[in-house]
């Protein structure tokens, strides 16, 4: 056959679906690779062809669209499973072609099983709720397009294994789950089961997401430098190791980039000749406030190094702060026989 633009295996779109549930999978060509949509392609006389390679096989084969009850079907640029089976796992290819044009892309589809508590190998989306911030909602994800608006589905919400029923601050409201006032105890996995009828059959969609309660923007502050501070003086003799920790607290801020850096005499450590190393560690609180520590280390400090200005800087979406470390050369202890004797006027 003639040449085909092959976009290869799009592993960025690792699609995971639950066994025994409907799944609708759009051909990625129109979403990520081509500059036109399916309708335009169809109008131009292009045909969309689907095929697949089973798990642990090399052989590409056509998809069987003649299964009982149309278990697998195609509608425009969507491949439908009603429902999926475990052995549908494999690499799927959609190819758009006519006599003069051809473009194709493959993507992996994994059909996974869930246990009695909805646990599975499925990668879960994370939804962050602000602590004690008033009413916040999560919405049952990825259920659009499965049933027409005329169909009224039944939605059941669970936290972990348990149906959300008479919970204090969590209220199911159809496709939404409302948190009246989010607390740390609300952290966990939440599952919605959407049940809908279609052609005399009942289908279930199961969607699980992780809720993480994080610091509220109401409580957010600019970075706070705990160290260096005015109470600690780094007093060293030449030849000793100089270690100065810069410890900064950052309030949780959605999509904020937290930065900590040192300057030595106003320059970044990389831009000066002294042998300095910086090690960073990061820890998080339960509400994802962050504490970053950068330890500036000079193995064998010189008297010149001890005259330099060491400043710790920190920046977040809330602002920028800086604090200088108090560094000084240690005055050597007097040698008794010489200095003290001289002091007493001994000859």
């Amino acid at each position: 056959s003639e040449r085909c633009d092959d976009w290869g295996l799009d592993t960025m779109r690792q699609i995971q679906v639950f066994e025994d549930e409907p799944a609708r999978i759009k051909c990625p060509l129109f979403e990520h690779f081509l500059k036109f949509n399916y309708s335009t392609a169809h109008s131009a006389g292009l045909t969309l062809i689907w095929y697949w390679t089973r798990q642990d096989r090399d052989l590409e084969e056509p998809i069987n669209f003649r299964l009982p009850e149309n278990r697998i079907s195609k509608e425009k640029d969507v491949l439908w499973f009603r429902p999926t089976l475990l052995n549908d796992t494999g690499n799927y290819t959609c190819m758009l072609r006519n006599t003069t044009y051809c473009s194709k892309v493959a993507f992996p589809l994994e059909v996974v099983q869930k246990d009695s508590c909805f646990n599975s190998p499925m990668k879960l989306p994370v939804h962050k709720l602000y602590i004690e911030y008033g009413i916040q909602r999560i919405t049952c994800p990825n259920v659009d397009g499965y049933f027409p608006s005329s169909v009224k589905p039944t939605i059941t919400w669970y936290m972990g294994c348990y149906k959300i029923q008479n919970f204090n601050n969590v209220i199911p409201e159809g496709m939404n789950l409302s948190f009246l006032i989010a607390l740390i105890s609300n952290n966990g996995n939440y599952t919605c089961v959407v049940t809908y009828p279609e052609n005399g059959r009942t289908f279930h969609l199961t969607r699980t997401l992780t809720v993480k309660v994080v610091g509220s923007p109401k409580n957010a502050v600019p970075p706070v430098i705990h160290s260096p501070n005015d109470h600690v003086v780094y007093e060293k003799e030449p030849g000793e190791e100089l270690l100065i920790p810069c410890t900064v607290y950052f309030s949780f801020l959605m999509d904020s980039r937290n930065e900590v850096w040192w300057t030595i005499d106003g320059k970044k450590p990389d831009d000066i000749t002294i042998d300095v190393t910086i090690n960073e560690s990061i820890s998080h609180s339960r509400t994802e406030d962050e504490t970053r520590t950068q330890i500036l280390s000079i193995k064998k400090v010189t008297s010149e190094d001890l005259k330099r200005s060491y400043v710790c800087h920190a920046r977040s979406a809330k602002g920028e702060v800086a604090k200088a470390a108090k560094v000084k050369q240690k005055v050597p202890a007097p040698r008794y026989t010489v200095e003290l004797a001289c002091g007493f006027g001994a000859t």
Epitope: E19, D115, T154, T156, K163, Q165, V193
Partner: antibody, heavy 119, light 107 residues
Amino acid sequence: QVQLQQPGAELVRPGSSVKLSCKASGYTFTSYWMDWVKQRPGQGLEWIGNIYPSDSATHYNQKFKDKATLTIDKSSSTAYMQLSSLTSEDSAVYYCARDYYGSIGMDSWGQGTSVTVSS
Amino acid sequence: DIQMTQSPSSLSASLGERVSLTCRASQEISDYLSWLQQKPDGTIKRLIYAASTLDSGVPKRFSGSRSGSDYSLTISSLESEDFADYYCLQYASFPWTFGGGTKLEIK
């Protein structure tokens, strides 16, 4: 279509045990919980408990905790309920039914097995 | 355990008549309620789930509704095959519990 097949009847001696079966077909057995329900002659329905075939997780009605044991054979898509230390109080029809995580209750029922405890 | 009080326990009605059965929940069950029909041969079939959603294949003369803690099954026009026992079931919390049942007899 969904079918839950149960034997019609079992005659058992007092003090003995009986293992009732429920063979499922027409759906993915491991995706649905299997429930068991008791009905004494001329009486109403009582929920005994349920089991999830995929990992054998169970919920029991406290009333039946020491009476019933639920198990699964995935290879034959069959659910079992063992009833122990049988007395005349255990004479009843026992139904199996499937449910999806308790989201919409029990949607398909077996025909029931009539258990008679008699010496 | 949640108690489901079903009324009436028995009901005589004529063909074509409209009848309603009621279940009252002792605690909040948030529409986690279904209605079951049991025929004289013991066969059990679900009619309604989520308080008001009709199962596929169930005639439209059956309907379910809720008013406070009272849940109702209404048959708008009785047909001969409707004469059977009816049970409500709450599946809000374990253990799941049934109403005592209503025997619907032909007058």
